[in-house]
């Protein structure tokens, strides 16, 4: 018959044969043969493999390091990755949690709508029109633009979001 | 790698007064928001106030609004805390906190005890 070149879920191919992939958990040992099936090992302690795979190697378990804040939320098994997350009152910096902060900044054309808490991290709100924010910062509001008028001035330079707007005198000149 | 280091806690009794400082090395202070945390024993962090990196904007939580008064010193790379008024229930260890905040930067924090 004629060597597959195509196999089926949970298979592989090699040297024009399929042979199973290892479950979760597992590693590869040795392919199969002609005669023998796919040898495979299970992982081991503090290590993991989450998808059925030809792998030689499991992956490590993921360390949540106390020096960064961190703490394990969920122990990892023979199928699973370590789940970290950050102490009590501090705020993981992606959703991978690698490290922790008090809290986040609003960047500069953003405001804070709700300063941080013990449980739930900074919200921030774009600056709409009329308002901006030149820095980052935790708790400032977008701030609204200057008012030229009140002070007997013109806008020379429009305000964005990032920037107030710029007074200067009126021009007296008359034609 | 910055380094904030706090001073200025003890013991002092109900209504009195308390200045703490915050004395940053290691990086730049000039132009960082900063912020004072502190920790109740057994509690949680508690943000208590923050100041901009201008000086010009200042933040209080509610429970020292009026008692407490933040401001910075950026020729001497210290934020400072004024502490007025003090009661029992501002016992804590305080923290100062300089952008972005991350739990590297944390310094030991400074012992406040208001007792009779």
């Known amino acids: 018959p004629e060597p597959p070149t195509a196999c089926r879920e949970k298979q592989y191919l090699i040297n024009s044969q399929c042979c199973s992939l290892c479950q979760p958990g597992q590693k590869l040992v040795s392919d199969c043969t002609e005669f023998t099936e796919t040898e495979c090992l299970p992982c081991g302690e503090s290590e993991f493999l989450d998808t059925w795979n030809r792998e030689t190697h499991c992956h490590q378990h993921k360390y949540c390091d106390p020096n960064l804040g961190l703490r394990v939320q969920q122990k990892g098994t023979s199928e699973t990755d370590t789940i970290c997350t950050c102490e009590e009152g501090w705020h993981c910096t992606s959703e991978a949690c690698e490290s922790c902060v008090l809290h986040r900044s609003c960047s500069p054309g953003f405001g804070v709508k709700q300063i941080a808490t013990g449980v739930s991290d900074t919200i921030c709100e774009p600056c709409p029109v009329g308002f901006f924010s030149n820095v980052s910062s935790a708790f400032e509001k977008c701030h609204p633009w200057t008012s030229c008028e009140t002070k007997d001035l013109v806008v020379q330079q429009a305000g964005t979001n990032k920037t107030d707007v710029v007074c200067g005198p009126q021009d007296r000149l008359r034609a | 790698e910055v380094q904030l280091m706090e001073s200025g806690g003890g013991l002092v009794q109900p209504g009195g007064s308390l200045r703490l400082s915050c004395a940053a090395s290691?990086?730049?202070?000039?132009?960082?928001e900063m912020w004072w945390y502190r920790q109740a024993p057994g509690k949680g962090l508690e943000r208590v106030s923050?100041?901009?990196?201008?000086?010009?904007?200042?933040y209080y939580a509610d429970s020292v609004k009026g008692r407490f008064t933040i401001s910075r010193d950026d020729s001497k790379n210290t934020l400072y805390l004024q502490m007025n008024s003090l009661r029992a229930e501002d016992t804590a260890v305080y923290y100062c906190?300089?952008?972005?905040?991350?739990?590297?930067?944390w310094g030991q924090g400074t012992l406040v005890t208001v007792s009779s």
């Open positions: 290691g990086s730049t202070f000039a132009g960082y």
């Open positions: 906190a300089k952008d972005p905040y991350s739990f590297d930067y």
């Open positions: 923050a100041i901009s990196g201008s000086g010009r904007s200042t």
